[in-house]
Interface confidence: medium
C-alpha cells in the first residue's frame, strides 16, 4: 500500500499514524499548494485543524483582507490558519467546529457546532454555522445567520459602523455583534469593561476580554 | 441592570431647537450605543439616530440627518438628542434606549420618555 | 432602505391564541436578527423578543417569535391570550443603514 505523502487536514494525519500534537505540513484541496497548521492531536480523541489561536497578545490581529484570506502569525503560537484554505477545505466536506475559551480566573469553556463552513471570497467568507452544544453558552454568541468576514480594509458587515476598524480584528460581525475572537489582546487586570476585546458574551458578558482561545475543525465523520 | 433617566417635558416654538438628556446608570455607559426613538401621537416608532459615546461617533437616519445631533458626555454618563428647525409634526414623545450588547441594533433597556411639544 | 409591514389591528378573544405579521420589503428577512416590542399607553416601549426567537427572562412563555424565508416574513405569536397583553405591537430590524421598525399592530383582546 503507498503512503499518503499529501494530507488535506490534521484528521488524515492523525489516522496515517501521525498522532503527536505539532506543525504539520497539509495541502489545498485540489491543489499542490501547501500551508503549515497547527494539530491538536490530543483534544477529543485529536485530528482537530487548528484554524485561530489566541494566547499572549504577541500577534496584531488588527490585519487587512489579504492577510487574513492568507493566514497570518506562527502555528506554534497565535495565529490565524487562512480563510481562503478553511472555505476550501470546508467546501469539500461537512465540519464540525469547536471553539476553547479560557478566562483569566481560571475556568474554561467550549462551544461546539455540528457542520460548520466558510462560503467563498466572492460571499465574503460568509460563516455557515448549526447545531450548538457545550459549555460556552446556550446562545451562540456567532451571529445566526452568519455574517460576512469583515476587516479593517473590507467592510462587510450590517452596521451603519465599521465594526472592524471600531472593534480591532477581522471577524464575522453582525452590528456589531456579540463575539470577536481576533479582538484587542488585553493582559490581566486590564481584561474588563473592554469593548474592543476578545469578546465571547453568551458565556463571560459584556466587556470581558478572554485569556485565550482556540477554534479547531475536524470532519464530523472523525 | 441598566436605567435610563430622560430630562422633562418641552414645549418649543417652531422654527426653534430642543435638546433633550439621558443619564445612564447601571452599565458600562461608553461602550454601549444609545439611540433615540421618537413616536409621534397616533404613530409608531421612528429611529432617529445613535451614539457610541467611547468613539464619540454617531449615526443618523437618513430622515433627520442634517437637523438632529447626538452626542454623549462619558464624565456624567449622560447622552443628549438636539433636534433644531423645530415644526408641528415632530411633536412626539422622545425616547433613548441601548443595548445590554455592545453597539447591537436592538433596544433592550429604554428610557421613560420626554414629551417635546412643537406649538406656536 | 426596506419596509417593515405589519397589519394595523388584530383581535382575539382570551385563551386564544394570535400570530402577528411582520413582512420585509426587500433582501431576506434571515439576513438581519428580528425583534419584537410591546408598547402601552403611556409607557415606553419593551422588547418581548429579539434574535428571531430568543425570550428575554421575565417574558412569559406564551410569546414566541418565528421567521419564514418563503413569505419572507417574522411572526410574533402569542398564545393562552390575556387581558394585560392588549398593547402595540413593533417588529424591528436593522441592516448597514441603521434601525428600522415595523408599523406597529393594534392588539385587541376582546370580551
Known amino acids: 500500500k503507498e503512503e499518503q505523502t499529501t494530507f488535506r487536514d490534521c484528521a488524515e494525519i492523525f489516522k496515517s499514524g501521525l498522532t503527536t500534537s505539532g506543525i504539520y505540513t497539509l495541502t489545498f484541496p485540489n491543489s499542490t499548494e501547501e500551508i503549515k497548521a497547527y494539530c491538536d492531536m490530543d483534544v477529543g480523541g485529536g485530528g482537530w485543524t487548528v484554524i485561530q489561536h489566541r494566547e499572549d497578545g504577541s500577534v496584531d490581529f488588527q490585519r487587512t483582507w489579504k492577510e487574513y484570506k492568507e493566514g497570518f502569525g506562527s502555528p506554534l503560537g497565535e495565529y490565524w490558519l487562512g480563510n481562503e484554505f478553511v472555505s476550501q477545505l470546508t467546501g469539500q466536506h461537512r465540519y464540525v467546529l469547536k471553539i476553547q475559551l479560557k478566562d483569566w480566573e481560571g475556568n474554561e469553556a467550549h462551544s461546539l457546532y455540528d457542520h460548520f463552513y466558510l462560503a467563498g471570497e466572492e460571499s465574503n467568507y460568509r460563516i455557515h454555522l448549526t447545531g450548538l452544544t457545550g459549555t460556552a453558552g446556550k446562545i451562540s454568541s456567532i451571529s445566526q445567520p452568519g455574517s460576512d468576514f469583515s476587516t479593517k480594509d473590507s467592510d462587510n458587515d450590517k452596521c451603519i459602523c465599521k465594526c472592524s476598524q471600531m472593534l480591532s480584528g477581522g471577524w464575522w460581525f453582525d452590528a456589531c455583534g456579540p463575539s470577536n475572537l481576533n479582538g484587542q489582546y488585553y493582559p490581566q487586570k486590564q481584561n474588563t469593561n473592554k469593548f474592543n476585546g476578545i469578546k465571547w458574551y453568551y458565556w463571560k458578558g459584556s466587556g470581558y476580554s478572554l485569556k485565550a482561545t482556540t477554534m479547531m475543525i475536524r470532519p464530523a465523520d472523525f | 441592570q441598566v436605567q435610563l433617566v430622560q430630562s422633562g417635558a418641552e414645549v418649543k416654538k417652531p422654527g426653534s431647537s430642543v435638546k433633550v438628556s439621558c443619564k445612564a446608570s447601571g452599565g458600562t455607559f461608553s461602550s454601549h450605543a444609545i439611540s433615540w426613538v421618537r413616536q409621534a401621537p397616533g404613530q409608531g416608532l421612528e429611529w432617529m439616530g445613535r451614539i457610541i459615546p467611547i468613539l464619540g461617533i454617531a449615526n443618523y437616519a437618513q430622515k433627520f440627518q442634517g437637523r438632529v445631533t447626538i452626542t454623549a458626555d462619558e464624565s456624567t454618563s449622560t447622552a443628549y438628542m438636539e433636534l433644531s428647525s423645530l415644526r408641528s409634526e415632530d411633536t412626539a414623545v422622545y425616547y433613548c434606549a441601548t443595548s445590554r450588547l455592545e453597539w447591537l441594533l436592538y433596544l433592550d433597556y429604554w428610557g421613560q420618555g420626554t414629551l417635546v411639544t412643537v406649538s406656536s | 432602505n426596506f419596509m417593515l409591514t405589519q397589519p394595523h389591528s388584530v383581535s382575539e378573544s382570551p385563551g386564544k391564541t394570535v400570530i402577528i405579521p411582520c413582512t420585509r420589503s426587500s433582501g431576506s428577512i434571515a439576513s438581519n436578527y428580528v425583534q419584537w416590542y410591546q408598547k402601552r399607553p403611556g409607557s415606553a416601549p419593551s422588547i418581548v423578543i429579539y434574535?428571531?426567537?430568543?425570550?428575554p427572562s421575565g417574558v412569559p412563555d406564551r410569546f414566541s417569535g418565528s421567521i419564514d424565508s418563503s413569505s419572507n416574513s417574522a411572526s410574533l405569536t402569542i398564545s393562552g391570550l390575556k387581558t394585560e397583553d392588549e398593547a402595540d405591537y413593533y417588529c424591528q430590524s436593522y441592516n448597514s443603514r441603521g434601525v428600522m421598525f415595523g408599523g406597529g399592530t393594534k392588539l385587541t383582546v376582546l370580551g
Open positions: 434574535e428571531d426567537k430568543q425570550r
